[in-house]
């Protein structure tokens, strides 16, 4: 049977194509530091397909190496703003299960006001992802400046 | 039949794979923020498999979410001179069908001669995408330094 | 016969499913500005499906077009200490076969402590990615920092 | 069409004070964010200064330590302090919302209000 013919007849998530793209909803509260985010048409060019959100944090549901992405853009800030509220970090990261926790992406505003990076990355089931900004400094709900999500790439 | 046969036996635009990375042709008329592109085997590491440009900006053909990336550095640049000429944007987005228009990723270079990011996001046969660099620096022509592409992820 | 079939019957390899992410091992002697690379799950979330490495370097095993990218962060670094040491470079390129030599992505630090970016690149069975890092600055280690890896998009 | 209502601009000599206010309608008031935008002539919109519903404040490099950004939750309105007023401030000022609503969000602005420093 023809690839082109599977590619219809089996669901798109069977073929492994998880991808999630998400929008910033809010921070925390003062001493949470963590992004919580949100994803859906309805909310203009965000969707989850495969992934799903958990109070506003992105949870895995299929094993697997994945390409995730950010990019995050602070509100209010010039490239003197960043360096005198120095240190401004992202950490995007495991957060649960806490067995698996640990940091997979870091970067420092320094005189910067975005931050964007990328890398490949085994995730599992149930891994939970968290985007973690510490500072003062608010970061732009403006969908074309934040944004993070992830690709499924391979098994 | 076997996935690797099928791989030989249909065209590989029928298994969705639209993919293009283009080098800066020019930058447009004092009026005209648009970045100019261009691509092809003839012009080094640049190409575009499915995608055309339309007078040097890049017109999706087929239906999907897409990775779009980008780089720009700045010809002549320190991080004073960014900051001298500070705002100087550089945004993405769909320029055209004038219904679709919306931008999907901005950023200004502050102190900074690069800015390079990337995201996910649906885009339809048709759209075409543009990227405004706003301010009085000029983009280097390097293809190493400034490029744009794009690649199909699912439908 | 099924996708999700041939899935499991084929080695992934048939798939063209090759990818590789990377952690930092050390910086080259003095006059040799490569990073040098490691990889495997034994050291953590790095590894090699497909390219393999030769003596730190990356060497690629299947032709076809390739997301190359990279994040690398200097390890004791301001914006003033990067400004100061200026210009600190990272370059991207095909340093083996000689034939192929080129540069694919190369940036500046400026003021920053990091450096993020990515592109679709053509490479070829064999080609060998060396990622230089010009200047007098250390990069760090840290595997949340520093990284780069390779994804196969397409033949 | 929600409006925002602001008031407490006008003429005053450099080292001056003045404080504006705007008034937000009360069903818009749990956002991410209410901020002061100001445009000078011939140049871009900024953000001078923000407070998140929780009372965090965020300011511009150019007024830090000057203006002082504050809200009355019972009266549904936010406040901006100018103190030590210079030439450079003047420009027109927008009360801006940035608020949660079933769509992910919804931005309110208010006409604008002049602020005129004269040295």
């Known amino acids: 049977q023809r690839f082109a013919q599977a590619q219809q007849q089996l669901p798109l998530e069977s073929l492994g194509w998880d991808v999630a793209e998400l929008q910033l909803n809010h921070t925390g509260p003062q001493q949470d530091p963590r992004l919580y985010w949100q994803g859906g048409p309805a909310l203009g060019r965000s969707f989850l397909h495969g992934p799903e959100l958990d109070k506003g944090q992105l949870r895995i549901h299929r094993d697997g190496i994945y390409m995730v992405h950010i990019q995050v853009t602070l509100a209010i800030c010039s490239s003197t703003t960043a360096s005198r509220h120095h240190p401004t970090t992202l950490a995007v990261g495991i957060c649960s299960p806490a067995s698996r926790s640990i940091s997979l992406l870091r970067l420092s505003f320094h005189q910067g006001c975005t931050i964007a990076s990328q890398r490949l990355t085994p995730l599992a089931r149930g891994d939970t992802l968290c985007t973690n900004l510490t500072g003062t400094l608010l970061p732009s709900r403006n969908t074309d400046e934040t944004f993070f999500g992830v690709q499924w790439v391979r098994p | 039949q076997r996935f690797a046969q099928a791989q030989q036996q249909l065209p590989l635009e029928s298994l969705g794979w639209d993919v293009a990375e283009l080098q800066l042709n020019h930058t447009g008329p004092q009026q005209d923020p648009r970045l100019y592109w261009q691509g092809g085997p003839a012009l080094g590491r640049s190409f575009l498999h499915g995608p055309e440009l339309d007078k040097g900006q890049l017109r999706i053909h087929r239906d999907g979410i897409y990775m779009v990336h980008i780089q720009v550095t700045l010809a002549i640049c320190s991080s004073t001179t960014a900051s001298r000429h500070h705002p100087t944007t550089l945004a993405v987005g769909i320029c055209s069908p004038a219904s679709r228009s919306i931008s999907l990723l901005r950023l200004s270079f502050h102190q900074g001669c690069t800015i390079a990011s990337q995201r996910l996001t649906p885009l339809a046969r048709g759209d075409t995408l543009c990227t405004n660099l706003t301010g009085t620096l000029l983009p280097s022509r390097n293809t190493d330094e400034t490029f744009f592409g794009v690649q199909w992820v699912r439908p | 016969q099924r996708f999700a079939q041939a899935q499991q019957q084929l080695p992934l390899e048939s798939l063209g499913w090759d990818v590789a992410e990377l952690q930092l091992n050390h910086t080259g002697p003095q006059q040799d500005p490569r990073l040098y690379w490691q990889g495997g799950p034994a050291l953590g979330r790095s590894f090699l499906h497909g390219p393999e490495l030769d003596k730190g370097q990356l060497r690629i095993h299947r032709d076809g077009i390739y997301m190359v990218h990279i994040q690398v962060t200097l390890a004791i670094c301001s914006s003033t200490t990067a400004s100061r040491h200026h210009p600190t470079t990272l370059a991207v390129g095909i340093c083996s076969p000689a034939s192929r030599s080129i540069s694919l992505l190369r940036l500046s630090f400026h003021q920053g402590c990091t450096i993020a970016s990515q592109r679709l690149t053509p490479l070829a069975r064999g080609d060998t990615l060396c990622t230089n890092l010009t200047g007098t600055l250390l990069p760090s280690r840290n595997t949340d920092e520093t990284f780069f890896g390779v994804q196969w998009v397409r033949p | 069409e929600v409006q925002l209502v602001e008031s407490g601009g006008g003429m005053v000599q450099a080292g001056g004070s003045l404080r504006l206010s705007c008034a937000a309608p009360?069903?818009?008031?749990?956002?991410?964010?209410m901020g002061w935008y100001r445009q000078a002539p011939g140049k871009q919109r900024e953000l001078v200064a923000l407070i998140t519903g929780d009372g965090r404040t965020n300011y511009a490099d150019s007024v830090e330590g000057r203006f002082t950004i504050s809200r009355d939750n019972a009266k549904n309105t936010v406040y901006l302090q100018m103190n030590s007023l210079k030439p450079e401030d003047t420009a027109v000022y927008y009360c801006?919302?940035?608020?949660?609503?079933?769509?992910?969000?919804?931005?309110?602005w208010g006409q604008g209000t002049q602020v005129s420093v004269s040295s």
């Open positions: 801006y919302a940035d608020v949660f609503a079933r769509a992910g969000r919804d931005e309110y």
């Open positions: 009360g069903k818009i008031f749990s956002f991410y964010f």
